[in-house]
Interface confidence: low
Amino acid sequence: ERLPLTPVSLKVSTNSTRQSLHLQWTVHNLPYHQELKMVFQIQISRIETSNVIWVGNYSTTVKWNQVLHWSWESELPLECATHFVRIKSLVDDAKFPEPNFWSNWSSWEEVSVQDSTGQDILFVFPKDKLVEEGTNVTICYVSRNIQNNVSCYLEGKQIHGEQLDPHVTAFNLNSVPFIRNKGTNIYCEASQGNVSEGMKGIVLFVSKVLEEPKDFSCETEDFKTLHCTWDPGTDTALGWSKQPSQSYTLFESFSGEKKLCTHKNWCNWQITQDSQETYNFTLIAENYLRKRSVNILFNLTHRVYLMNPFSVNFENVNATNAIMTWKVHSIRNNFTYLCQIELHGEGKMMQYNVSIKVNGEYFLSELEPATEYMARVRCADASHFWKWSEWSGQNFTTLEAAPSEAPDVWRIVSLEPGNHTVTLFWKPLSKLHANGKILFYNVVVENLDKPSSSELHSIPAPANSTKLILDRCSYQICVIANNSVGASPASVIVISADPENKEVEEERIAGTEGGFSLSWKPQPGDVIGYVVDWCDHTQDVLGDFQWKNVGPNTTSTVISTDAFRPGVRYDFRIYGLSTKRIACLLEKKTGYSQELAPSDNPHVLVDTLTSHSFTLSWKDYSTESQPGFIQGYHVYLKSKARQCHPRFEKAVLSDGSECCKYKIDNPEEKALIVDNLKPESFYEFFITPFTSAGEGPSATFTKVTTPDEHSSM
């Protein structure tokens, strides 16, 4: 019968920082130079041997004279309590098939980490422990005096634990959060009654969880250096040098080379000239608590990020075409580049792609004359597109061309004794049609009754009108816009010898917020179109004169413009244009885009005051210059009489007082006799005009006292 191989020489050492017990032992009676498979059962007790807190088996192959090692980590700091360890063994080897049995237990080995030294009566453990956010942590206090009441606080909030013995209480902190990089404060305070006996604190360093680097990528711009970048995520550095920021290491598996990166989010890798094409990089992030890694495998030629093109130029620039040229940094022989061109101008953007070798060239056509363009180019590897380079760009301006459209021309004709005064207006050509800076306008006046007679007036830009005094003949007027290159087509207008101001009734119209909707009867005979012109009724016609051309088959239009202001009256005239370009006035219209209430009240005179009546008149009140069509007047009258006069009706004023009101519906009726009055009586009146938008402003009443019957005024 074999002797059981009892473990002997059990020694237990501790590592306070790791909270671990390290066991060492040997097995006597092992056959010399023989290996045996054995199982060791380990028992760990806390505070007293009977309080077994952990039992486990450890299997290993044992050699003669071998010192065996095994470690165990305690969730409770070792300083908190005495631990006891013992061990027994069992042979579990095929060489000994007969039933085996456990050896005796070794004697208990007592382990005590004494950090509760000195005169202090209270201790808190562990000190300065480093853990990761979300882990569970056990802390404890050791109190010398069991009469003391001890309270513990985590960041100022009281925590409650489990008493292990009269001196020791442990606290389980579940899933500890990161609070600050200078650590989480835990305090315990011992007191008897209301008297504090002392306080102890520890700092628990909670690290944020190290993240896997994101967006890891490498690329080259010259086949000499690989530039690798990544998003490092949260910095896990802690204060008091407890944990520095995580480090990053690049490892390339094909070459077996490794590089510690000095930056937190990028690293350069020297490409050796040994024609290595495929790279397998592992980026390792590491702090004191864990490692994280991410991998990329790529072919070097598929990761080319070119430097941006240079020497961008424009050649043979004319009014509508240009040649764009550029260079790219050559990085390898026989390299083909794909380049993208963007052309910005006149609010539009065009895009073109072109394949090149070293020097790029692109013909830009269908450009607008006299226009500033911004062209830019970027390039990439055409064979294995990885990503575009940065843009390189330049501005250029096309040359001018002759104006492409005739100016839009209209006129006002006023008859004076013996002649016509023609005020000619034209609109500036749009940028699209001016094709450059308009320098001057040529106005050619030709007398159609005397064909050989014509005059040329050259008017410098930016003038947009001119006044011509013509006799009672028919005239053809041409207006031509000129820039540095040439002249536009001519705009032709004919002034008839016949007076055109035949009596045409003016019609009132109502506008809307959107403008004015106009319609008219078609002109008999052939027309080439209609013209609607308009201006502010109250102003000098030259100040705010506008017109609109309408096609020959249209007899209505909407005039909408932001220039229409509420309370302003506009006059419209509608002309038909004959095939001979002679204008004929068809209709006149006037109205407000939005009527407002009158801006002022009339100045009222009191006439023929008698004991029974008086006359009110406001003859000088102008109805024309008002912010709406005056529809009539309201006459308000106050007196001590309880009843209103005949023709008047009761009304309530805005201040709540009562009075009598009379309505005049004719805006030209500017007098009223107020009669049936009482002698020696006190009256008050107030007259205000009204439009569709309301009355004029409130004003004070004017006082009138009728004389006695015997007086004469």
Epitope: R180, Y187, M199, G201
Partner: antibody, heavy 118, light 111 residues
């Protein structure tokens, strides 16, 4: 080194306003709260309010609500305290103090004397 | 705003131990940490003790703080002439209108 430098002494009439500045240096301005504390002659310390230089949010002691405005300019690392409708009892030394995450005022300005009299 | 209550004065001879009390309520000292400030004549206050009993660097270890329930105390052991100053306790108050409250202040005289 870390320091808070306050603007100079002010003499004001009742009903007027005063604006005191406090320029921080030697640390990351937006990482610490700033408090304002005042001390009337021969009296104790009185807390007025707090500003978070990062977002600019403020909280004032109820006693000063409606009269005090605390602002900051991150480009110059400066906080300001404006007290309006001054009365004679506002005569005091006004301190700015840096507030730590553990609620203590670890760095104090040198103080600005504000005198209010007609 | 209700301040924390401190004795107006305390005194001792050089080398003696002096203790200053600070009384509050459940809404301030009872539920928050206590800080102590020293104000030498004509100067700005200086942080002496924070979080009930923690000393900032540079503060001699003869100064110690403690807290129990709704009261706190500051002890100066081995009193020295340069300790003659005003001492203030302080804490956040969690009442409806949260604010930072200071003690009424204690004048320490070295005899």
């Amino acid at each position: 080194q870390v320091q808070l430098v306050q603007s100079g002494a002010e003499v004001k009439k009742p009903g007027a306003s005063v604006k005191v500045s406090c320029k921080a240096s030697g640390y990351t301005f937006t990482s610490y709260y700033m408090h304002w504390v005042r001390q009337a002659p021969g009296q104790g310390l009185e807390w007025m309010g707090i500003i978070n230089p990062s977002g600019g949010s403020t909280s004032y002691a109820q006693k000063f609500q409606g009269r005090v405005t605390m602002t900051r300019d991150t480009s110059t690392s400066t906080v300001y305290m404006e007290l309006s409708s001054l009365r004679s009892e506002d005569t005091a030394v006004y301190y700015c103090a840096r507030g730590t995450t553990y609620d203590a005022f670890d760095i104090w300005g040198q103080g600005t004397t504000v005198s209010v009299s007609s | 705003q209700s301040a924390l209550t401190q004795p107006p004065s305390a005194s001792g001879t050089p080398g003696q131990r002096v203790t200053i009390s600070c009384s509050g309520s459940s809404s301030n000292i009872g539920s928050n940490t206590v800080n102590w400030y020293q104000q030498l004549p004509g100067t700005a206050p200086k942080l002496l003790i924070y979080s009930n009993n923690q000393r900032p660097s540079g503060v001699p270890d003869r100064f110690s703080g403690s807290k129990s329930g709704t009261s706190a105390s500051l002890a100066i052991s081995g009193l020295q002439s340069e300790d003659e100053a005003d001492y203030y306790c302080a804490a956040w108050d969690d009442s409806l209108n949260g604010l930072y409250v200071f003690g009424t202040g204690t004048k320490v005289t070295v005899l």
